[in-house]
Interface confidence: medium
């Protein structure tokens, strides 16, 4: 039975040209995290595997940095980066947990962070 929950940074906004940290946290389970995938729609951004280490997809290596922790830092943001991001936690023995973050990249300087929320 999957008892865990994923807490994410929720809906967030950031300025064009700036950077943002995408963060998820798995709680309420003793399952072992074997891998975390970060995806944007159908594109794989990065992987953090417990044994094999971090890997950033080739097309994102110049502006995506691993961390902090199991999070992901997006740099040199463009308006095209606006959209849904998913953290996918592969765990044993529970299975897969998925968290969703919506990022809006703004032209102006009125970007502000949204509240945290949970996905069961």
């Amino acid at each position: 039975m999957m008892t865990g929950t994923i807490e994410t940074t929720g809906n967030i906004s950031a300025e064009k040209g700036g950077s943002i940290i995408l963060q998820c946290h798995l709680s309420s389970t003793t399952a072992q995290v074997t891998q975390v995938n970060w995806e944007q729609q159908d594109q794989l951004l990065a992987i953090c595997n417990a044994d094999l280490g971090w890997h950033i997809s080739p097309s994102f290596k110049d502006r995506v940095a691993p961390g902090p922790g199991l999070g992901l830092t997006l740099q040199s943001l463009t308006v095209n980066d606006t959209g849904e991001y998913f953290c996918i936690y592969h765990t044993y023995p529970d299975g897969t947990y998925t968290g969703r973050i919506f990022l809006e990249v703004l032209e102006s300087s009125v970007a502000e962070h949204g509240a945290r929320f949970q996905i069961p």
């Epitope: 891998q35 044994d51 280490g53 890997h55 080739p58 592969h90």
Partner: antibody
Framework: EVQLQQSGPELVKPGASVKMSCKAS????????MHWVKQKPGQGLEWIGY????????KYNEKFKGKATLTSDKSSSTAYMELSSLTSEDSAVYYC????????????WGQGTSVTVSS | EVVLTQSPAITAASLGQKVTITCSAN?????VHWYQQKSGTSPKPWIY???KLASGVPARFSGSGSGTSYSLTISSMGAEDAAIYYC?????????FGAGTKLEIK
């Protein structure tokens, strides 16, 4: 210079076990995952599994669970693979290969250990 | 499990000829690499992450592709290029290889 030196050829009887070694030099063994790959004569490459010498964590191809056992010895910078209950299907060359986390690929390979199962 | 199918299985090319080897996946593949293996030797990394040439690989080699279709191309076949080429992918938690393409000199 990174080198993976594998143990010599083995001729074993059906039903027996064999343990081969892969000695790493030129880098710290605990910093890189070690993979093992099987190649039957005249055939392609088949992934067996890997061991993380840092914490002895292993991951196996389902097909090789119960057949292969991966271990490592940090003090001698050596990775081992034991194959059990051998049959003619296990006759092959077995390679160890270092995992490069930057590319998520195998960057250095041992010269291979040939295993022949015959009565 | 992601299954990689290489084609052709065997091909022959004249010196100076352009050669293309393909690797198709039954579902979207991650981190596709190519290895070269010559008879009696261990495989060598040849192309990393679809298109990055490994150290020492001649510039006449190139790699491309995305999703389920990938290819290795030699712009001008060289004598030392005769070998077997394998594609490989990693998709949690399995590593799989293609069956290989044997490239010979015509």
């Amino acid at each position: 210079e990174v080198q993976l030196q594998q143990s010599g050829p083995e001729l074993v009887k059906p039903g027996a076990s064999v343990k081969m070694s892969c000695k790493a030099s030129g880098y710290t063994i605990t910093s890189y995952v070690m993979h093992w790959v099987k190649q039957k004569p005249g055939q392609g490459l088949e992934w067996i599994g890997y061991i993380n010498p840092y914490n002895d964590g292993t991951k196996y191809n389902e097909k090789f669970k119960g057949k292969a056992t991966l271990t490592s010895d940090k003090s001698s910078s050596t990775a081992y693979m034991e194959l059990s209950s051998l049959t003619s299907e296990d006759s092959a060359v077995y390679y160890c290969a270092r995992w490069n986390p930057y590319y998520y690929a195998m960057d250095y390979w041992g010269q291979g250990t040939s295993v022949t199962v015959s009565s | 499990e992601v299954v990689l199918t290489q084609s052709p299985a065997i091909t022959a090319a004249s010196l100076g000829q352009k050669v293309t080897i393909t690797c198709s996946a039954n579902s979207s593949a991650r981190y596709v690499h190519w290895y070269q293996q010559k008879s009696g030797t261990s495989p060598k990394p040849w192309i990393y992450e679809i298109s990055k040439l490994a150290s020492g690989v001649p510039a006449r080699f190139s790699g491309s592709g995305s999703g389920t279709s990938y290819s290795l191309t030699i712009s001008s076949m060289g004598a030392e290029d005769a070998a077997i080429y394998y594609c490989q992918q990693w998709n949690y938690p399995l590593i799989t290889f293609g069956a290989g393409t044997k490239l010979e000199i015509k």
